[in-house]
Each structure stands twice: as C-alpha cells, then as structure tokens.
Interface confidence: low
C-alpha cells in the first residue's frame, strides 16, 4: 500500500480541531506582483514581507511596494510601509538582514534617474523603526555585513568603487576604485580584485588581488595575474594566469594571502572553470571542469592545507561556469554528500559519499519501489535524486533535497528509481539514516519542510490547480494526516518556516484570484497542540550513525570516530522544543588505511585501500611548491584525511624535506608583495 495508508498508521487524535484553532489567515491588501520574505534574527518571531507590484505605463513602468512585519511567526502582519516613507524598494537587492541576532536590516530604495546616489533604509531594532540614508553612490550589489561586526558594511557601486561604512550605513567612504569583486574575510578583512586597463571583463586574468585589514586605511597587493578568487573555510583561493599561455592554476593561502602555494590540481583553459563545491576548516571539495563543452568535470578533495588533492569523483555533472551542479551537503549526518555524474551513455546518475568524498556509491534502491524504464534489470537499480540540475531543466521538481543539522539522519528529496534520473514525474523519498537507506514517502512531487527538529514533517502537493490541503507526519514520513486549512483553495506559491527547523509554525503562501483582482494571502499553522507534551528521556532511543555491520567492532567509524545519537522514537508524538540540542556521544576509532588519503604523486587503484606511486612519477624526486619554496617530499604515500580523529592502529610514516629553493611560480612571492597606505 502507499505510504500513509498502512493499517498500523495511528491517527493523531482530534488534530483537525487542534489545527483549526491554530490556523491564522492574513490577506494582504495588495495586488499580486512579487513577494519576498525574510526572517529577522533567530527565535524572535520577526518576519518582514516585501510585496512589489509593477504597473506598466505607456512610457515607463511605475513600481509600488509594501512592507509588512510580523512578530508572532507570521500569524499576524502589520503594514509598516509608512516607516520607509512609502518608498519603492528594489527587490533585486532583497532585504539585507544582519548576521546572528543583530536585529539589523537594510532595504535599498529605487531612486529617480538624475539622483546623485542611491537611498537605503536602515533598522537596528528588528524593523521596528527605520532611518532613511541617502548614499553618495549608486549601489551595484546588496550591502554586505562583516561576519564579525554587523556595523561594518561594504558595497560596490555602479562605477566599480568599493565603499565601506563603519557605522551601519550612516556614513560611507570610497576606499578603492576599479574594483571587480569584494568579499569579507575573517577579522573584518576585505579581499578585492582591481583592474588597471578599463574594465573587469577586459582585465580578466590580469586583475590584482588586494587586501585591507583596517577597513581601507592601508592595503596590500597579495596577488597579480588574477582571474578570480574565492574564500572557503580557512582557505583563500585564487586562480592565476600562467606566464606562457592562456591556462590558469589554483593557488591557495591559509594566512590571508601572505604566502601562497600552488594547489596540485590540473590547470584549466579559457573555456574551463574551477568551483569550490564545499569547504570547511579542515578541507575543500574542488570541481575542475573537463576541457570542451562536456558538462562535466572531476571532483578533488584536499588535504588539510588545501594543497595536495586526491581525485574523488570522475564525470561530475556541472554544466557551465555559474551553471548547475547537484552537489549537496547532507547536513543531517557528518561526512555525507550527494551529487550527480554524467555516465558514458550520457544518462545522469546520483552518487553518494559517506566519508567526505573518499568513496562514492549509488543510492540503495528503496524497498517499497519498483525499478522504472531506465533500468536494464527490473530487480536491480538505484535511487536517483533530483536536485538543481533537474530544477533548471524545468522538470516537475519543486524543491531541492532537504536536510537539517538538528534533524539527525533525515534527508528528503525527489527521486526516481532506475539506472538513471528519469524525465518522468518524480516521487518524494526519505532517508532516516543519512542516506544509507530510503523509502518512498509521498507519491508525486511535493513541497516539504521539517519542523521541531524532525518531530514534524509538512508537505504540500505540487499542483497547477488551487490547493487547500496540507499533509503532515509525526513519525518521519511513515504515516500522513491531511488537514484542510481553508475552504477556499489558493494558488500556492511557497512554504515558509523559520530557518533552522526548530519552529512549530509553518506559513503557506499563495494568492486568491477572483474575476477582478488577485491578492496575496498567507496561512500560518502552529503545530504546538499536535505535539501536546514535551519529549522526555523515554521518548528517545540510542542510534549509531553510519552503522552498516553491527557485528564489526569498527562499525560506524567514519573519519576516525563514531557517534551515537539520542534520537526521537518514531512512535513518540511530543515536542523536541526550540531549545533542543542534538545529543551525541563520540568515540575514537583505531586508524586504518581508510583514514589516510594518498599523498602527492600517489593514487588508490579501484577497490584497493593501498596508495601506490603514480607510474609517471616512479623513481623521480617528488618536488612541489609550498609557501613559495620548492619542497622535496619523502613519503610512503599517505596523509591523514582532514578532520580524521583516529588514533593508534596503522600509522604510515611521512617526511618532508625543504629544498630551500624558490618555486618557479608566476605568482607573487612574499618578498615582492607591496603595501601602501591611504
């Protein structure tokens, strides 16, 4: 039988009455245009909603926007458009919400053609009040907050100036001209690229990379011949043009650009690209595009310095620079990532890794599913997940895969079961163990969200017709109840719940359409009365993550340690609550060869855990570039995987000798770098 129709599915008692008492409708006094929603702070209940409506006039387009505020998680909204002087807000800049619980908000206004600069509205009290500020420049990008100090803002102007404010947008100073890209680093550092000969596009590959650590008082040039740069975890990356040709290479720094090392990655040509897929303080997943318009490349994983890379996955689907990749970090279980590969027959298949890119495998076929027409053998196939690429191809996939750090082990995604991703209408699948096993959860495409740290899953069917029904599950998607939240169906546009999945409120957004008008409407449903009591100790059970063989002493060991979690029993209908903290008990594992990656010049043959020397490097001295010096590497081929905590057991020896010679790198060596002050 279909999910949710089994005999053992118990119904949640009196849920209709409980939900009816906690369903709040708000009709917005707006013609339907576009709507954007932002949460201000964490656990504050404050939501800002900006609606915009364009009226095309004969010669120009007249815009009108309204701003609404809720402080009860969306149950009630107040029109606060007068706080921003009824000004039209530019939606392309969105609402710039400050980091953490700063309560800061910046809205960028539309200004008339002849004005000297732009205009912003600033709030530092969770949008209770706004201050209008006229800018000395026209912004090109949204205001960017420093992660360390929300009073510090940076923005680029339409004239390519880099502007900084130290008092939350009250006063602005242009600290540099001819800037292409600027980013905040750690400790209020700003990194930016500059051009010399006319424009960012014309100088691509000849840009300079600059750094300021004092908000523009002084600068240091930390790189030349730059194509682009990026920050990931504690790593600063720059792609740098080679001296002789049009290829470029990745250089990496872990000291904010003072010293650089050449990453042991293939160089790329003009039509190719590098992309940082994921990065943390331990390591980086890097995609290197294949030559030609293939739509795929190779994933490499780095060592702890971001210098030595191991090939992780071939034929990784990534269409173009800034294009689509299905690479997804499964945040509900450590070490798990999902992505797609383009196989030799040009079909697209989903792969999963449970050990941070060490090994990739197909997803196990859900037990309650049949293989589809993509399968050569009707009894042997895999689950294939729809993500960004499928969405970009306008397939019937309303949402990307979903996981939440505090809903341990839960992954929800659209998928198909066969030998490859199918163009057919997908179903929704759920994993409760971080991707090891899967079950069909819902028939057909749905929108879905996780509430109360996994205590409730909510879903709405994806339909072109108006809807008035919401589905919810209190047992991780095994059984489903349906609730009619309104008599009058609405054209559904989105589900909104507070980021972090701790809330018990869900907002259903849509519009009503009558003969003469259409209006935005939201229904906010509070599930607090469905989960009547707080969860107690008896409601939780011990779960060993990554467990595949309970007989094995090392069962659950991933990256050198195993973790036991306290997880809510599926049968318990209770509140984890807003203050719920994931309880986990780690224990260290003995080291095995699986805890080491292959060092520079070594690789792992398929289905072998030993690292062997690359044939072309056999008998050669292994020399590589480190911090602008040439190093001589004496190694037996292993280096500990970044973040691996294993102890004892196997311990391959490794030694690096400094050759005390300069690298032949076209990148600036530290001595050549220059500084200047304003």
């Amino acid at each position: 039988s279909a999910p949710g129709e089994d005999e053992e599915c118990g119904r949640v008692r009196d849920f209709v009455a409980k939900l009816a008492n906690n369903t709040h409708q708000h009709v917005f006094d707006d013609l339907r245009g576009s709507v954007s929603l932002s949460w201000v702070g964490d656990s504050t209940g404050v939501i800002l909603v900006l609606t915009t409506f364009h009226v095309p006039l004969v010669i120009m387009t007249f815009g009108q926007s309204k701003l609404y505020r809720s402080e009860d998680y969306g149950k009630n909204f107040k029109d606060i458009t007068d706080l921003i002087n009824n000004t039209f807000i530019r939606t392309e800049f969105g609402m710039a919400i400050g980091p953490e619980n700063s309560g800061k908000v910046v809205l960028t206004a539309e200004v008339s053609g002849g004005s000297r600069g732009g205009r912003i509205f600033r709030s530092s009290d969770f949008a209770k009040n706004f201050v209008q500020t006229d800018l000395p420049f026209h912004p090109l990008t949204q205001m960017m907050y420093s992660p360390q100090n929300s009073d510090y803002l940076l923005a680029l102007s339409t004239e390519n100036g880099l502007w900084v404010s130290k008092n939350f947008g009250g006063k602005w100073e242009e600290i540099h001209k001819a800037v292409c890209l600027a980013k905040w680093g750690s400790d209020n550092t700003i990194f930016f690229t500059t051009y010399a000969n006319g424009s960012c596009k014309a100088d691509l590959g000849a840009l300079e990379l600059w750094r300021t650590s004092d908000l523009g008082k002084s600068f240091k040039t930390i790189g030349v011949k730059i194509y682009s740069f990026g920050l990931g975890g504690r790593f600063l990356f720059a792609s740098v043009m080679a001296d002789k040709d049009t290829t470029r290479r990745i250089h990496v720094s872990t000291d904010q650009g003072d010293t650089w090392s050449m990453a042991q990655l293939p160089s790329v040509g003009q039509e190719q690209f590098y992309s940082i897929l994921a990065a943390n303080d331990d390591m980086v997943f890097m995609h290197v595009d294949e030559p030609g318009d293939t739509g795929f490349g190779t994933i490499f994983t780095s060592d702890d310095r971001g210098i030595v890379y191991s090939k992780s996955l071939d034929r990784h689907l990534y269409t173009t620079t800034g294009g689509e990749t299905d690479f997804t970090n499964v945040t509900s279980l450590r070490g798990v990532y999902i992505t797609s590969v383009l196989s030799e027959d040009n079909s697209i298949q989903t792969m999963i890794t449970f050990d941070q890119g060490g090994r990739w495998t197909h997803l196990r076929k859900p037990e309650n599913s049949e293989c589809d027409a993509t399968a050569k053998n009707k009894n042997e196939c895999s689950l294939h997940i729809h993500a960004s690429y499928s969405i970009s191809q306008k397939l019937n996939v309303p949402m990307a895969p979903l996981s939440e750090p505090n809903a341990v082990g839960i992954v929800i995604a659209h998928g198909s079961v066969g030998d490859a991703i199918s163009v057919m209408v997908p179903d929704v699948y759920i994993s409760d163990d971080g991707g090891y096993s899967w079950t069909k959860m819902l028939e057909g495409p749905h929108y879905y969200t996780i509430l109360d740290s996994g205590g409730i899953i909510v879903a709405i069917e994806h339909s072109s017709r108006p809807i008035n029904v919401i589905k919810f599950s209190t047992d991780e998607g095994q059984c489903w109840q349906t609730y009619t939240f309104t008599r009058d169906p609405i054209y559904f546009t989105g589900l909104a719940s507070e980021p972090g999945a701790r809330s018990m409120n869900i907002s259903i957004w849509g519009f009503t359409e009558s003969f003469l008008t259409s209006q935005w409407v939201s229904y906010t449903i509070d599930f607090k009365d469905i989960l009547e009591r707080n969860c107690e100790e008896k409601d939780y059970t011990i779960w060993l993550a990554h467990s595949t063989d309970p007989e094995d002493y090392e069962d659950g060991c991933i990256l050198g340690y195993k973790e036991q979690f306290l997880r809510l029993r599926k049968s318990s209908v209770c509140q984890n609550g807003r203050d719920y903290v994931v309880t986990k008990q780690p224990s260290i594992c003995l080291c095995s060869l699986e805890d080491f990656l292959c060092d520079f010049g070594y690789y792992r043959p398929e289905n072998d855990s030993k690292c062997v020397e690359q044939p072309e490097l056999k008998g050669h001295d292994l020399e590589f570039c480190l911090y602008g010096r040439e190093e001589h590497l004496t190694t037996n081929g292993y280096r500990k995987i970044p973040g691996d905590k294993c102890q004892g057991g196997v311990n391959p020896v490794r030694e690096v000798k400094d050759l005390k010679k300069k690298c032949t790198s076209n990148f600036l060596s530290p001595e050549k770098q220059n500084s200047k002050s304003n």
Epitope: L342, I348, E370, D372, A373, Q393, L395, V423, M424
Partner: antibody
Framework: QVQLVQSGAEVKKPGASVKVSCKAS????????MSWVRQAPGQGLEWMGI????????SYAQKFQGRVTMTRDTSTSTVYMELSSLRSEDTAVYYC??????????????????????WGQGTTVTVSS | EIVMTQSPATLSVSPGERATLSCRAS??????LAWYQQKPGQAPRLLIY???TRATGIPARFSGSGSGTEFTLTISSLQSEDFAVYYC?????????FGGGTKVEIK
C-alpha cells in the same frame, strides 16, 4: 520486427472522450518510453506527452494537461491515450512513437538525443457534431 | 517551451540537386535534436538523431549538422523518393517541440 500497431479510426461528438491504443511488439516493452504525437489536417506535428511503461508515470505537454491520460498494460505491451472533452480542433491523426530519449534525463551538452525511432501507423480521430 | 522555427517553409529543388534545410531553436538545445521525414498519408520516419547521427537504414546522402540553436539538414543529391515534408524536433527540455516543417517539392 519492431512495430507499433494502433487501433482503428474513430468518429466522436464534441464533449466526448476517445481512447486510442498502441500495441508494441518485437522489443522489450518496458525498456522504452512511449510518446504520443498528433497531426491536425494539413498541419505540423505536435507532441502530447510521454509515458514510462514500468511505473506508468507520465509527463504531459501543458496544452493537454487535465484532458489527456496516458496509461499502459504491461501484460499486453499496450499503451493507451485517452483525450476527453473533445472539440472540433482535436480532429487529427494521433501517433504513438517509441522514445528512447526517456531512458534518461537530458544531460548537458554532450548528451545525444536518440529520436522517436519507431512510429505507429496513426489513428484518425474525427470530432464532429 | 522551446520554439523551433524551420526555414524555408517550401523548397523547390530539381532531382540530383542539393537541398539545405534550416532549423532554429529559441534557446540552446545543445545536440538534442532529431530530423524526421514524412510523406503524405504516412507516419513520420526518423532520419537524424543527436543533431548529426544518421538513424539505422538512412542513406548517406542525408546529413545533419549544428548545435546550440542553429541546425541544418542537408540532402546532397535529391532522389525522387526524397520529396516530402521534413520536421526538426528538440528534446533538450520538456515539452518536446517540433518545427513547423519544410516541404521539399520538385522544381
């Protein structure tokens, strides 16, 4: 040999429904998707939708959404296309066509499209009061 | 949806001559394109798939080229049995769409 044999011509009144069948032979029915394409008199070809013969899941062109239903019977290797609420502009020849492209989602750039390689002989549906 | 435009609508060619048919897509369809031939009272027949690969049993005088948005079907030396209507079709994005057709007639 591989062939698709469709049901005979139909004459229907406006508002009625028509159900056209397409029987496959000479290949493994569950290995290929089936597309339906129609052609109004003197007009070009128009794709209606596609069906997956194993799961029976479908994907329809927006224009026919809500009016068309594609089903299959694996025991007889037959695919059906039902069009409801018929109007005079639905008068056309309806073709089923084997569509290997359904075997995988269109990949980027390098993916090859295999085309609808086997067609039924067509079924003429006339809608007239 | 992707709109496919064929030109010319009608092409008058003498037997033995070369015929060049064009097909343009409103956005890139990469190489996910097929060409079909249809004669009066018959079902369409697949000629070319993947923009340039001849289907089984199709004579070498038929060739396809192009990628992205511009495609061409070339018949190097027209035979009497080649006078028909030719359609291009994309399968890059659903729904699959056909061009309006080019009728190749005897001059």
């Amino acid at each position: 040999q591989v062939q698709l044999v469709q049901s005979g011509a139909e004459v229907k009144k406006p508002g009625a429904s028509v159900k056209v069948s397409c029987k496959a032979s000479g290949y493994t029915f569950t290995k290929y998707y089936m597309s339906w394409v129609r052609q109004a008199p003197g007009q070009g070809l128009e794709w209606m939708g596609i069906i997956n013969p194993i799961g029976g899941s479908t994907s329809y062109a927006q224009k026919f959404q809500g009016r068309v239903t594609m089903t299959r019977d694996t025991s007889t290797s037959t695919v059906y296309m039902e069009l409801s609420s018929l109007r005079s502009e639905d008068t056309a020849v309806y073709y089923c066509a084997r569509d290997p492209s359904g075997i995988a989602l269109a990949g980027p750039a390098s993916r090859s499209y295999y085309g609808m390689d086997v067609w039924g002989q067509g079924t003429t549906v006339t809608v007239s009061s | 949806e992707i709109v496919m435009t064929q030109s010319p609508a009608t092409l008058s060619v003498s037997p033995g001559e070369r015929a060049t048919l064009s097909c343009r897509a409103s956005q890139s369809v990469s190489s996910n394109l097929a060409w079909y031939q249809q004669k009066p009272g018959q079902a369409p027949r697949l000629l070319i798939y993947g923009a340039s690969t001849r289907a089984t049993g199709i004579p070498a005088r038929f060739s396809g080229s192009g990628s992205g948005t511009e495609f061409t079907l070339t018949i190097s030396s027209l035979q009497s049995e080649d006078f028909a209507v030719y359609y291009c079709q994309q399968a890059r994005l659903g729904p699959w769409t056909f061009g309006g057709g080019t009728k190749v007639e005897i001059k």
